[in-house]
């Protein structure tokens, strides 16, 4: 907290300019009018204020706007944004995508901080949904943003926004999140032809049900093993050996390397050994000839 002292004669700031960087903290507090600062915030980021001086500027704005800064100030905060606490940011009403971009730019290249998370939350709540432009912006700065949202929050993503999603944006999503995103992606890409559709839908397939996987197996998609391993176990289990063979195409050989891992392991346990043998991969653990597994839940519990 800076002491309240009178501004020395001739030092009263008429405008926000570079001469102010040589003011002591108390001079800055005494000689810069908060209203002047607020109206000339666009100049602040171009002036190399010292670390301590930024604290003084924040203090002045806090006094002027105890209920929260107006957007005209927020969009020009620059490095001052990094002096804000989540509590400060909760008081803001940010509606402009340009303001959001300006503040995200300040934190660019760093992990999402509590301040940024609060800012995004305020912005998205203000908009009512995650529209395409917002999603474009957020995933450009934070590729993992989508996967940081709860399934409930993801439900507000309109299918049209899915076009903005890149495969790397889904890297850290769990099955519950993909369950929400997959139907939206299916809707978004429904008018694409087979091969183009598969390229787009591939990253979302961790949320696909069995019937969609069966349909894909009829389309010569040649799914890679990395994608197959991310499929829901409950969606893979009902697939026949022939369907998995068609689904994977030339990648079917990769099953051998993954036979001890889910969902491949669990899928093998559900197949007749005879059928598995037709693949010629040496997969073991299928149901022996003449056996009938009745209690499937017990079978899974034992495995």
């Amino acid at each position: 907290e800076v002491e309240k002292t009178a501004c020395p004669s001739g030092k009263k700031a008429r405008e926000i300019d570079e001469s102010l960087i040589f003011y002591k903290k108390w001079e800055l507090e005494a000689c810069v009018d908060a209203a002047l600062l607020a109206t000339q915030m666009d100049r602040v980021n171009a002036i190399p204020f010292t670390y301590e001086q930024l604290d003084v500027l924040k203090h002045k704005l806090d006094e002027l706007y105890p209920q929260g800064y107006p957007e005209s100030v927020i969009q020009h905060l620059g490095y001052l944004f990094l002096k804000m606490s989540p509590e400060d940011i909760r008081k803001w009403n940010v509606t402009s995508l340009e303001t959001l971009k300006a503040l995200l730019e300040v934190n660019k290249g760093h992990e999402m901080s509590p301040q940024v998370a609060t800012l995004i939350d305020r912005f998205v709540k203000g908009r009512g949904q995650l529209d395409k432009d917002t999603l474009d912006t957020l995933t450009a700065f934070y590729p993992g943003y989508l996967c940081s949202l709860s399934p409930e929050e993801l439900s507000s993503v309109p299918p049209s926004s899915i076009w903005a999603v890149r495969p790397q944006d889904l890297d850290t999503c769990d099955p519950r999140q993909l369950d929400v995103l997959y139907p939206k992606a299916r809707l978004a890409f429904q008018n694409m032809n087979g091969s183009e559709y598969f390229v787009k839908i591939q990253s979302f397939l961790g949320g696909a049900p069995t019937e969609d996987l069966k349909a894909l197996s009829q389309q010569n998609v040649s799914m890679d093993l990395a994608t197959f391993m991310k499929l829901r176990t409950d969606a893979v289990l009902p697939l026949t050996v022939a369907e998995v063979q068609k689904l994977l195409g030339p990648h079917v050989e990769g099953l051998k390397a993954e036979e001890r891992h889910r969902p491949v392991r669990d899928w093998i346990l559900r197949q007749r050994q005879d059928d598995l043998d037709t693949l010629g991969l040496g997969l073991q653990g299928g149901i022996p000839n003449g056996y009938l597994v009745l209690d499937l839940s017990m079978q899974e519990a034992l495995s």
């Epitope: 190399p48 670390y51 002096k83 934190n107 290249g109 760093h110 992990e111 901080s113 509590p114």
Partner: nanobody, 119 residues
């Protein structure tokens, strides 16, 4: 994190010159502006000069025309060239910067280098 190491200080006669260096290491790509401060005995620390990534500089009025600041971006070194030194320039000179990290700003200082100007 950023490490700053100053050098080049010493004892010099009034009217003489010194060139201080500040070598930065660590997260130097995040640095925008470098600052030279000084602190005379019993006085408050004061800003002497600044230089930003683009090479724009600011120099305190009381040393303008005598002091200049420059940088060697390739070596991550900032210099403070001090000419026509006066006894009142006697102080410990510090290099400083701050960078964004983890959603906040972090302030970094060198250990300081003593400049003594005798009359």
């Amino acid at each position: 994190q950023v490490q700053l190491v100053e050098s080049g200080g010493g004892l010099v006669q009034a009217g003489g010159s010194l060139r201080l260096s500040c070598a930065a290491s660590g997260s130097t790509s995040s640095i925008n502006t470098m600052y030279w401060f000084r602190q005379a005995p019993g006085e408050e620390r004061e800003l002497v000069a600044t230089i930003n990534r683009g090479g724009s500089t600011n120099v305190r009025d009381s040393v303008k025309g005598r002091f200049s600041v420059s940088r060697d971006s390739a070596k991550n070194i900032v210099y403070l060239q001090m000419n026509r030194l006066k006894p009142e320039d006697t102080a410990v000179y510090y290099c400083n910067t701050y960078i964004p990290y983890g959603g906040t700003l972090h302030d970094f200082w060198g250990q300081g280098t003593q400049v003594t100007v005798s009359s």
